[in-house]
């Protein structure tokens, strides 16, 4: 019989092997680090480890053998929180709980692994886990006056408790108190994600900006990163569900072929090849820069036109380790004479996925490891914030405060966690005994919210799609969904009449100084002038007869008392009882790819900011036209708000970004927009009991 082909293993330059500690040395180090022994170096005799191992096994709910068995070794090798299980980091000041309920936090630094708004959102949701079951509130501030300072750091990062590189120790936090006490630190040598691989936002396509789902299947093949397969225009795309072949949901990935960032090229895509200092470039380059940022020209000749932009980076192909950490995979690349258009484990005996960071590994030997599933920043943060509130580790494996990392999508709090936090702070006044599933389950950062579930697919970037080979994503239908029938409320009061029972409102708007909450053809008015007053429900059809019963957003221009209503790609404008519309959004100067207005925020001089998902335009309220040159990304103006907000409005000089049951409130502070509060729409805006 023919011999089975033996795999070829290759020596990769700068391939750092894992530690050569023996199992006993590893255990000794672990037992000391996490508080089970006093002395770091013991005699090395197995007997001397026995009491400490028994204590460890009890704490982690493992079989109590007192031996360094396989299950114990597996636990020792698992990623975990860096806070000791026995005792504290050290003796601390005070009684290790906060003595005020309005806790503040400052995000001092960020990781590059996730977009900043996803990081902000992950932390806000992690705090919401605890505020949902306590009387505590958490407000974001900007500076060292914060109770809890959040930092990403590597190795020795300013507290005497160094991190350990990738995996192992993920994060640590200190119990409540002044200075470093209460602070939470995250190891930036980890890949931070939402627990299911690199987070890559999508643009256009038909998935409402949902992030890529890795792996996804296309034409029967599995993809762990964005691909240009099936297209001939070089634009990378991905499936946003596990099976593109079945679901046909997709979006375009950040790419210099789609857009550029910052620079002066108005966000246009790169033009390849382009001329710079007399040389031709057919890819993004770092030439002419000392900071290593990749850039390109957005016309064919930079020397002549001086139009440029930075090339977007993509988390799914940004490598770690190897000899090119921080660089991006180049696909296809040549390895041992063969072409690869996705990460591979070929040439490695450990099965780890890697890629080349130039088009030819054989020639250049430049490589790195491809991203793994990463660690859920939300789950790790929720755990660390438990420490920052005064909780110790739990020995219940299902508890959030168990020291080992375990990814799951269920509500993270266990009865043991709730019992512990209630012991410190008492019960919350909120009726929901647990944070809602959207807080707990790892949400995909741009999954369409409930109210947008019937949104039509977005069109391609301006210029129309390049005709793709069969099977490649194609744009979907563009018509707005038909409006449901508008129902008059029944005479008797039903639970449906109570806005506190509404999960997610269609839209919220400030009209004549009162907040209007719209849902399924009805609305409620809420005013907090002279005591909280709630009126309604009223029928939209009675107040504004020409308007469909459903809407995405509403906005009042108070000067001429005009009210703008938006539903998908259409707009209605009411002045008193007269109505103009429906008008198509492209009449406002928006491209045909804009199929939703999330909201308008008033600005001085008869202007407003018009927001559509992750983009913003300046809008002239009088001419009802956008300035097409003014388009910018949401996170350039409003860092820290959800990029998948389904409704945006202004109320009492603050902007509100709604996602699911929550709102992010933004105030203008020190010349920048800053999120100063994250809370429930019903409990906190509507003042529901």
């Amino acid at each position: 019989a023919p011999h089975q082909r033996q795999p070829t293993y290759v020596v990769f330059p700068r391939d750092l092997k894992t530690s050569n500690l023996t199992d006993t040395q590893l255990a000794e180090d672990y037992l000391y680090r996490y508080g089970y022994t006093r002395a770091a170096q013991m005699m090395g005799e197995k007997q001397s480890l026995r009491p400490a191992l028994l204590m460890l096994q009890k704490q982690l709910s493992l079989p109590q053998t007192g031996e360094l068995d396989s299950e114990t070794l597996k636990a020792i090798r698992s990623p975990r929180c860096g806070v000791p299980d026995v005792g504290k980091f050290q003796t601390f000041d005070g009684d290790l709980k906060w003595h005020h309920h309005n806790i503040t936090y400052w995000i001092q630094s960020y990781t590059e692994d996730l977009p900043r708004d996803v990081i902000d959102d992950s932390f806000a949701r992690a705090f919401a886990v605890w505020s949902a079951v306590t009387p505590l509130t958490f407000t974001r501030v900007y500076g060292l006056e914060a109770d809890i300072v959040i930092q990403f750091g590597v190795a020795e990062h300013g507290d005497g408790y160094p991190f350990d590189g990738k995996d192992g120790l993920l994060a640590h936090a200190f119990p409540p108190g002044p200075g470093i006490q209460g602070d939470a630190h995250f190891d930036d040598d980890e890949l931070w994600s939402l627990g299911k691989g690199a987070v890559v936002p999508t643009y256009f396509g038909n998935a409402n900006g949902a992030p890529c789902h890795f792996p996804f299947t296309f034409e029967g093949r599995s993809y762990l990163s964005c691909t240009t397969d099936g297209r001939n225009d070089g634009k990378p795309w991905c499936g946003t569900t596990a099976d593109y072949d079945t679901d046909r949901k997709y979006g375009f990935c950040p790419s210099e072929n789609l857009y550029t960032e910052h620079g002066n090229g108005d966000g246009k895509p790169c033009v390849f090849p382009f001329i710079f200092e007399g040389h031709s470039y057919s890819a993004c380059t770092t030439k002419g820069r000392s900071d290593g940022y990749r850039w390109c020209a957005t016309t064919a000749n930079y020397d002549q036109d001086k139009a440029d932009g930075f090339c977007p980076t993509r988390a799914d192909v940004t490598v770690t380790g190897g000899n090119s950490a921080g660089e991006m995979c180049v696909f296809p690349f040549v390895f041992l004479g063969k072409q690869y258009s996705t990460c591979t484990s070929e040439g490695r005996s450990d099965g780890r996925l890697w890629c080349a960071t130039t088009s030819n590994f054989d020639a250049d030997k430049k490589w790195g490891f491809c991203p793994d599933q990463g660690y859920s920043l939300f789950l790790v943060a929720a755990h660390e914030f438990g420490h920052a509130l005064g909780l110790d580790h739990s020995s219940v494996p299902e508890a959030l405060m168990y020291p080992m990392y375990h990814y799951h999508e269920d509500s993270p709090l266990h009865e043991d966690d709730i019992k512990g936090i209630h012991h410190l702070y008492g019960r919350g006044s909120k009726p929901d005994p647990r944070p809602p599933a959207t807080t707990a389950a790892e949400p995909q950062p741009t999954a369409p919210p409930t109210m947008c579930s019937t949104a039509p697919p977005m069109a391609y970037p301006t210029g129309g799609p390049t005709v793709a080979p069969t099977g490649a994503p194609s744009p979907g239908p563009t018509g707005p969904p038909t409006a449901g029938p508008s129902e008059a409320p029944t005479e008797s009061s039903t639970p449906d009449d109570n806005p506190c029972n509404v999960d997610v409102f269609d839209a919220i708007a400030d009209i004549q100084g009162a907040l209007h909450f719209f849902k399924d053809g009805r609305y409620w008015k809420f005013s907090n002038h002279g005591g909280n007053q709630l009126q309604g429900p009223f029928l939209i059809a009675r107040t504004w007869p020409a308007f469909p019963s459903k809407l995405n957003s509403a906005f009042e221009d108070p000067q001429p008392k005009k009210i703008f209503f938006f539903l998908w790609a259409q707009m209605w404008v009411y002045t008193g009882q007269s109505v103009l519309g429906p008008r198509s959004l492209d009449k406002l100067g928006l491209g045909s790819e804009v199929t939703l207005v999330t909201g308008l925020l008033p600005r001085r001089g008869g202007k407003a900011l018009l927001i559509s998902r992750e983009r913003i335009w300046k809008f002239d309220l009088k001419s009802q036209k956008v300035d097409p040159q003014s388009v910018t990304r949401l996170d350039n103006e409003f860092s820290g708000v959800p990029w998948n907000s389904h409704n945006v409005f202004q109320y009492q000089d603050k902007a509100y970004f709604c996602h699911d049951k929550y709102f992010w409130r933004v105030s203008f502070h020190n010349r920048v927009n800053q999120v100063d509060h994250v809370a429930y729409v019903t409990y906190d805006l509507l003042q529901c009991p």
Epitope: Q90, L144, V154, G160
Partner: antibody
Framework: QVQLKESGPGLVAPSQSLSITCTVS????????VHWVRQPPGKGLEWLGV???????NYNSALMSRLSISKDDSKSQVFLKMNSLQTDDTAIYYC?????????WGQGTSVTVSS | DIVMTQSHKFMSTSVGDRVSITCKAS??????VAWYQQKTGQSPKLLIY???YRNTGVPDRFTGSGSGTDFTFTISSVQAEDLAVYFC?????????FGGGTKLEIK
């Protein structure tokens, strides 16, 4: 209010050792790290080392072999010990509280190395 | 060790002028840069932490910016009392290191 005060010998003979005590008030050494910085006459600032809240230390690599920092949390005191002094160790020695920057400094103690 | 380079040892300016002092790190230090002011015969005073945050009580004419390797400290309208030496410092990786200092002179 927060205060740090260094006390040292003033004059040290070459090859002898230096001991400086930094006494702090208004905060706990369990909540903030303390750094040591020196400044030779007419020159810039040179970072010497730090003792963190848990007692671990980091040192300037060039001085590590002759530098040691310790503390007594209960007495709110931090100690700097430096061996084998030479004339170029003449400087003002400062202790400073650290929290994302050295936000409070002592007034400094002048040390002259001379025979 | 990370080297922090302040390219100007001296800068001369007039009252009311805007002045910027630069500091370059030999490797990426993210936003972990602090700026200190030291007046003759006094201890240094923390003005800016985390690259761009003003310490409590620091007048808002003092601002900081930058991330990675390039940092800038700006006084928007110089006052006579701003005569001092200004130091940058990184606290990303130990050993923490200071820049050589920039002496601001008032014309």
């Amino acid at each position: 209010q927060v205060q740090l005060k260094e006390s040292g010998p003033g004059l040290v003979a070459p090859s002898q050792s230096l001991s400086i005590t930094c006494t702090v008030s208004g905060f706990s050494l369990l909540s903030y790290g303390v750094h040591w910085v020196r400044q030779p006459p007419g020159k810039g600032l040179e970072w010497l080392g730090v003792i963190w809240t848990g007692g671990t230390t980091n040192y300037n690599s060039a001085l590590m072999s002759r530098l040691s920092i310790s503390k007594d949390d209960s007495k709110s005191q931090v100690f700097l010990k430096m061996n084998s002094l030479q004339t170029d160790d003449t400087a003002i020695y400062y202790c400073a509280r650290y929290y994302y920057g050295m936000d409070y400094w002592g007034q400094g103690t002048s040390v002259t190395v001379s025979s | 060790d990370i080297v922090m380079t302040q390219s100007h040892k001296f800068m001369s300016t007039s009252v009311g002028d805007r002045v910027s002092i630069t500091c370059k790190a030999s490797q990426d230090v993210r936003n972990t840069v602090a700026w200190y002011q030291q007046k003759t015969g006094q201890s240094p005073k923390l003005l800016i932490y985390s690259s761009s945050y003003r310490n409590t009580g620091v007048p808002d004419r003092f601002t900081g910016s930058g991330s990675g390797t390039d940092f800038t400290f700006t006084i928007s309208s110089v006052q006579a009392e701003d005569l001092a030496v200004y130091f940058c410092q990184q606290h990303y990786i130990t050993p923490y290191t200071f820049g050589g200092g920039t002496k601001l002179e008032i014309k």
